[in-house]
Interface confidence: low
């Protein structure tokens, strides 16, 4: 047994460009806390897989408010170590996940809100009893500096915390065959209580006569690497080539129970009896309890009174996830109608409506033309949340107050000259062209291309554009 200890030294912007904005502000003060998750072995595992070696939450750090205009500094940290107790042997190799969480202390209805700022992960080898190891990890633009160590809890000693030490019974020396427990020279190794022949390197025991194996070793004396464990099986015929007994279909072969669980065969298959702090069909889940405060955002923790039992978080409205850690994106349901902008304020949804619409969900279409007058005989047309005037001939602008210059857009093609007229515009076409906008060339034989000139108008005559 022992304790894994993690000391966070700093959390702040990493080197290089793209410094992150401070996670806190005058409007939204916040504080940080950390979560560590440990797993045995060097396997690449998803962040969601069980923390089989254990997990711990830090205390909350000091409240921090960003100074306007200042770059994000190293943020104030919680006091103390994160400690993850381990009950069995220290595995020597482990994976870790360290999460930095932000607790927002603004005007939150229903308590503070949490969000994950950064997550770093790594795989390390570490002997128990050794010095602090220092590490730097980066997550996006953030940098986390920390140290860690594994130490054994008395009376355990050794790189795996599997040897036991006891105070000396005699003042001068230890008993026959027992060495002093360095560095505690006043203590001696406890008498060997494990099963006779149990491998001192790969086996350990917690009770007399027991021989429990470290990861990667198996057999009654923990002397067989897992890859060759089939030679131990008592079932099946002997293999002529290897001299091994070929294993039969034993449900407990290879011990499917993780984390030191013991396997017993049942009529259907097998059942795992899990050590304290682990559960799951194969003892694969570690025991975080309600006392660890695993439910975020005001979630109610049910069950989990001790590490042998699970907990479940019942989340308040607006949050979801097994730890209520995820804010439901209520804006994804597009509650704001008529093009309104959705704002999720945490305690409430707010819709910012486009012009011409109102109501909690922008559901009311205002009368755009109410109180609006269009000048000079223009008529008001509703549409799209804004009024529009359809102006009488010769007038333009938003309210038809501007006298339109029909020639401003240069409507006469092929060099035709434009004249403003009380009812519109008139194009005087250049030789060889005709039409209301001088758009049609006149053929050399005198016939027009299309359409035919109206009676009474010769090609080249100015045509009034009605």
């Amino acid at each position: 047994a022992g304790v894994f200890e993690l000391q966070i030294h700093s959390f702040g912007p990493g080197p290089g460009p793209g410094a992150p904005r401070s996670p806190c502000s005058a409007r939204l003060p916040c504080r940080l806390f950390f979560r560590v998750c440990l797993k045995p072995g060097l396997s690449e595992e998803a962040a969601e897989s069980p923390c089989a070696l254990g997990a711990a939450l830090s205390a909350r750090g000091p409240v921090y408010t960003e100074q306007p205009g200042a770059p994000a500094p190293d943020l104030p940290l919680p006091d103390g170590l994160l400690q993850v107790p381990f009950r069995d042997a220290w595995p020597g190799t482990f994976s870790f996940i360290i999460e930095t969480w932000r607790e927002e202390l603004g005007d939150q209805i229903g308590g503070p809100a949490w969000s994950l700022l950064a997550r770093v992960a790594g795989r390390r080898r570490l002997a128990a009893g050794g010095p602090w190891a220092r590490d730097i990890q980066r997550a996006g633009a953030w940098e986390l500096r920390f140290s860690y160590r594994a130490r054994c809890e008395p009376p355990a000693v050794g790189t795996a915390c599997t040897r036991l030490c006891r105070p000396r019974s005699a003042p001068s020396r230890c008993g026959p065959g027992l060495r002093p427990c360095a560095p505690l020279e006043d203590e001696c190794e406890a008498p060997l209580v494990c099963r006779a022949g149990c491998s001192p390197e790969h086996g350990f025991c917690e009770q007399p006569g027991e021989c429990r194996c470290l990861e990667g070793w198996t057999g009654p004396l923990c002397t067989v690497p897992v890859s060759t464990s089939s030679c131990l099986s008592p079932r099946g015929p002997s293999s002529a080539t290897t001299g091994c007994l070929v294993p039969g279909p034993g449900p407990c072969d290879g011990n499917p129970c993780a984390n030191g669980g013991s396997c017993s065969e049942t009529p259907r298959s097998f059942e795992c009896t899990c050590p304290r702090g682990f559960y799951g069909l194969r003892c694969e889940v570690s025991g975080v309890t309600c006392a660890d405060g695993p439910c975020f955002n005001g979630g109610l923790c049910v069950g989990g009174a001790d590490p042998d039992s699970a907990y479940i978080c019942h989340c308040p409205p607006g949050f979801q996830g097994s730890n209520c850690e995820k804010r439901v994106d209520r804006c994804s349901l597009q509650p704001c109608r008529n093009g309104g902008l959705c704002l999720d304020l945490g305690h409430a949804l707010r819709c910012r409506c486009r012009a011409g619409f109102a109501g909690p969900r922008c559901e009311h279409d205002l009368d755009d033309c109410a109180g609006r007058a269009c000048a000079n005989g223009g008529t008001c047309v509703e549409g799209g949340g804004a009024h529009r005037c359809s102006c009488a001939l010769g007038f333009g602008g938003r309210d038809c107050r501007e006298r339109a210059d029909p020639c401003a857009a240069r409507p006469c093609a092929h060099g035709g000259r434009c004249y403003a007229h009380f009812s519109g515009l008139v194009c005087a076409c250049a030789p060889g062209y005709m039409g209301a906008r001088c758009e049609f060339p006149v053929h050399p034989d005198g016939a027009s291309a299309l359409p035919a000139a109206p009676p009474g108008l010769r090609p080249g005559d100015p045509q009034r554009y009605l």
């Epitope: 069909l281 889940v285 069950g303």
Partner: antibody
Framework: QVQLQESGPGLVKPSQTLSLTCTVS??????YYWSWIRQPPGKGLEWI?????????NYNPSLKSRVTISLDTSKNQFSLKLSSVTAADTAKYYC????????????WDQGTLVTVSS | EIVMTQSPGTLSLSPGERATLSCRAS???????LAWYQQKPGQAPRLLIY???SRATDIPDRFSGSGSGTDFTLTISRLEPEDFAVYYC?????????FGQGTKVEIK
């Protein structure tokens, strides 16, 4: 090997209270969640509620006002009471263990058909 | 509550064929807190898969689960005669615990 065995009447009159008991053998009732699920004839499964070994309960909101689940650790039993029953409560009622690690129903009994009829 | 919708309602296949059953949640089921059960006529449901992809004790490896978020799948790689049954998915992420309406796998 964990086994669950239900007991209780198969016929209940409308407006009365349905009572069922589930006895756990081959293992302790401690450290697990114990649940009731029902299945109307020809239909799907509906979770009724669970009780944790320390007595904490959680019920389906649709039935919450009528359901009580209790536990007797000395007898390794847990019980369901459903009050003010109607014909819509006619179903096969199952007791099951929720595995605390996987939070899924890993052991079930064979179920008891309860008919609500006068 | 999270509503679980299974499709198809009925799947008609022959022994030896591959069966793919779908389960969709009305909102994200975090950490894959989803289980699959098999139920035969007159019997209680039997746990097949938990955690979206972990096989329960004594379940043959022809059964596999996958998916995350809102979309989950149960695959039976080669149907055996004893696999013809009704299959239910169940989420245990958010209370209340809810089941899908079931998919019946029948012999073609």
């Amino acid at each position: 090997q964990v086994q669950l065995q239900e007991s209780g009447p198969g016929l209940v009159k409308p407006s009365q209270t349905l009572s069922l008991t589930c006895t756990v053998s081959g293992g302790s009732i401690s450290s697990y969640y114990w649940s009731w699920i029902r299945q109307p004839p020809g239909k799907g499964l509906e979770w009724i509620g669970y009780i944790f070994y320390n007595g904490i309960t959680n019920y389906n909101p649709s039935l919450k006002s009528r359901v009580t689940i209790s536990l007797d650790t000395s007898k390794n039993q847990f019980s369901l009471k459903l009050s003010s029953v109607t014909a819509a409560d006619t179903a096969k009622y199952y007791c099951a263990r929720i595995h605390s690690g996987s939070f899924s129903f890993d052991y079930w009994d064979q179920g008891t058909l309860v008919t609500v009829s006068s | 509550e999270i509503v679980m919708t299974q499709s198809p309602g009925t799947l008609s296949l022959s022994p030896g064929e591959r069966a793919t059953l779908s389960c969709r949640a009305s909102q994200s089921v975090s950490r894959g807190y989803l289980a699959w059960y098999q139920q035969k006529p007159g019997q209680a449901p039997r746990l097949l898969i938990y955690g979206a992809s972990s096989r329960a004790t004594d379940i043959p490896d022809r059964f596999s689960g996958s998916g995350s978020g809102t979309d989950f799948t149960l695959t039976i790689s080669r149907l055996e005669p004893e696999d013809f049954a009704v299959y239910y998915c169940q989420q245990y992420d958010t209370s209340p615990i809810t089941f899908g309406q079931g998919t019946k796998v029948e012999i073609k």
